[in-house]
């Protein structure tokens, strides 16, 4: 018995294509690239029907439906734009992922363009079906920092967003009587990591043992401008506290530490990471100008004892900053060796300040970042961490501030963070 003539579906074909079909003949219905066979609301690659003894076909011819990749996956810290009109998500449609600039940028300079493939998945030429990654930009404040004229600016108020990497670290040990509470500064390196000085996070013991404070006792504030108003700031608890294993409490050698935040912080105009320098044992060049910010000493007559006894009271409500030149290593070493007391300026430190002293040359909290503008990448790089200074008041003549030389610890920092791609590489453009 002969079965009726078959019409292939729109965007499809039937095989074999014959003039006549008889009992037991079978045909395979398939669709063009980018289309799927649809039968009873079920999608399939092919569908077979057979000519029955009574001259009818075993099934109706199915339809061919265009492949739909459906709504593309959400991109963390990213946006999606549809290149095809009506926001189509069907075969050959195109979408573009982009990152929330200027706070995030796409890893590997990916185009972010994805096309709906015949298989029904969004595909990128390089990444395939994997989504791109948006990584934090570093060292680019939303407000441009002041031009580095060679003059100290003592205790100047920092505008909000000028130091978006600045973190206030508050340590409160409630297990001790009376409660121990102190503060320091740090610098945001990625959405999850803060760089600071080890002595800020060392448990305050009377002996020389180096034990980190319990992570439960650490709170980090980011995007903070005025300590009296923490409402606009992001506060985070610590997931990990990592002190450099060789930190020496007696001479403050290797005074560097990291805090991993409990949750990654959202970046924005007031919260952005600073860039790490290239590993460079020489450290920053003498006479280069850097900036240090902090809620610390803004009164040149405050002594170290007074700072310690002030407890949690920060000495400045609004974030202050100062501009300081790097001091030649030999000069700084000599200035400390000439003092009574056992001062050791090691190869893991550098000094900054002015010979003549002056107001606020040691402004800034322990652990705060000494940042230098890197001409190569056009970004701010953390070259130092506020570490220690002489016994005299802030700003005394020839008492330079001593900073941890961050560029000696690049490998250590990366190793602790364990995520080579958690910090974006600074783009360097001609």
């Amino acid at each position: 018995n002969e079965c009726p003539e078959l019409q292939p579906p729109v965007h499809g074909k039937i095989e074999p294509s014959q003039a006549k079909y008889f009992f037991k003949d079978q045909v395979l219905v398939s669709c063009d690239t980018g289309y799927k066979v649809l039968k009873d609301n079920v999608e399939m690659d092919t569908f077979q029907i057979e000519c029955l003894k009574d001259g009818t076909w075993s099934n109706k011819i199915p339809t061919c439906k265009i492949v739909d990749c459906r709504a593309p996956g959400e991109l963390e810290h990213g946006l999606i734009t549809f290149s095809t009109r009506n926001n189509l998500t069907t075969y050959k449609s195109e979408i573009k992922y982009s990152c929330q600039e200027p706070y995030y940028k796409m890893l590997n300079n990916n185009t972010g363009i994805y096309t709906c493939s015949a298989q029904g998945v969004w595909m990128n030429k390089v990444l395939g079906r994997s989504l791109p990654t948006c990584l934090p930009e570093c060292g680019q404040p939303s407000r441009s920092l002041p031009s580095l004229v060679k003059r100290i600016i003592g205790g100047r108020n920092a505008e909000p967003g000028l130091f978006p990497w600045q973190a206030l670290i508050v340590v409160e040990d409630t297990s001790r009587v009376p409660n121990d509470k102190w503060f320091g500064s740090g610098a945001l390196l990625s959405a999850s990591w803060i760089l600071t000085a080890a002595h800020v996070l060392r448990s305050q013991r009377r002996d020389t043992t180096v034990i980190p404070v319990s992570k439960e006792h650490v709170t980090v504030y980011l995007g903070l401008h005025d300590v009296r108003d923490k409402s606009g700031a992001v506060n985070s608890s610590a997931a990990r506290v990592v002190l450099h294993p060789d930190f020496n409490i007696q001479n403050y050698n290797h005074d560097i530490a990291l805090v991993q935040l409990q949750e990654p912080v959202p970046l924005g105009p007031h919260v952005m990471p600073v860039c790490l320098p290239r590993l460079e044992p020489e450290g920053p060049a003498p006479h280069m100008l850097g900036l240090v910010a902090g809620w610390g000493i803004s009164n040149p007559n405050v002594t170290v004892d007074e700072i310690i006894s002030s407890g949690t009271r920060t000495l400045s409500d609004v974030l202050q900053y100062v501009k300081l030149p790097v001091v030649p290593h030999a000069e700084c070493k000599t200035s400390y060796e000439s003092r009574s007391g056992n001062y050791s300026v090691t190869e893991n430190m550098f000094c900054a300040g002015y010979y003549e002293g002056g107001k606020d040359t040691c402004l800034g909290d322990s652990g705060g970042a000494f940042v230098i503008f890197d001409d190569l990448s056009q970004r701010w790089v953390v070259q130092g961490l506020v570490s220690w200074g002489g016994p005299e008041e802030c700003g005394s003549k020839q008492v330079y501030g001593v900073y941890t030389k961050v560029s000696n610890y690049v490998d250590w920092v990366w190793e602790q963070m364990g995520l080579p791609q958690s910090v974006v590489e600074p783009q360097v453009e001609r």
Partner: antibody, heavy 120, light 107 residues
Framework: QVQLKQSGTELMKPGASVNLSCKAS????????IEWVKQRPGHGLEWIGE????????NYNENFKDRATFTADTSSNTAYMQLSSLTSEDSAIYYC?????????????WGQGTLVTVSS | DIVMTQSQKFMSTSIGDRVSVTCRAS??????LAWYQQKPGQSPKALIY???YRFSGVPDRFTGSGSGTDFTLTISNVQSEDLAEYFC?????????FGSGTKLEIK
């Protein structure tokens, strides 16, 4: 994934110049230093120098400063090293390499090497 | 320039043994030292950086130690695939310099 693909074997005459290429893929080319390393049998490895493709900044080993020139084409993600005034001492395998992190100075990724033979 | 000395050009070992390759710097390089493995006809591969950090994917039988001027690469439970040449490299000062290499051979 990070890949560095180097140009093929070169047979050169003494006094000539050779231009070696190193095509990078799988990362942001402009942000990482490209290192060049020479290896002669029985002479171990010798660092020639480095270039930061994004800025064109270079650092050379004094032993090669007068004869090696590094360039980078950011449109094709390719770094080049030109070595001039070749002698038989320059017969070696030349590698390009890249650090793991943008801030590091040890070499995590290496090209397959280009063999240069200098012979009259 | 900083001279990196690998005094042993060859070292004989047996499968399953523990072997230590040493490297000495002519001046203090801090922790800024890397170890590489190179097999015949292949490019060098990074094993250890910052004197003691193992590069990703490197088996934990490879350990690095030392700081300043004296460094050691230790391979415990040597496997046949470890037979190769090992180079140290300082990256503390320009120019970066490599040791002359130590070849690991089977007894």
């Amino acid at each position: 994934q990070v890949q560095l693909k180097q140009s093929g074997t070169e047979l050169m005459k003494p006094g000539a110049s050779v231009n070696l290429s190193c095509k990078a893929s799988g990362y942001t080319f402009t942000a990482y230093w490209i290192e060049w390393v020479k290896q002669r049998p029985g002479h171990g490895l010798e660092w020639i120098g480095e270039i930061l493709p994004g800025s064109g900044t270079t650092n050379y080993n004094e032993n090669f400063k007068d004869r090696a020139t590094f360039t980078a084409d950011t449109s094709s993600n390719t770094a080049y090293m030109q070595l001039s005034s070749l002698t038989s001492e320059d017969s070696a395998i030349y590698y390009c390499a890249r650090s793991y992190y943008y801030a590091s100075r040890w070499f995590a990724f290496w090209g397959q090497g280009t063999l240069v033979t200098v012979s009259s | 320039d900083i001279v990196m000395t690998q005094s042993q050009k060859f070292m004989s070992t047996s499968i399953g043994d523990r072997v230590s390759v040493t490297c000495r710097a002519s001046q203090n390089v801090g922790p800024n030292l890397a170890w590489y493995q190179q097999k015949p006809g292949q490019s060098p591969k990074a094993l250890i950086y910052s004197a003691s950090y193992r590069f990703s994917g490197v088996p934990d039988r490879f350990t690095g130690s030392g700081s300043g001027t004296d460094f050691t690469l230790t391979i415990s439970n040597v496997q046949s695939e470890d037979l190769a040449e090992y180079f140290c490299q300082q990256y503390n000062r320009y120019p970066f310099t490599f040791g002359s290499g130590t070849k690991l051979e089977i007894k």
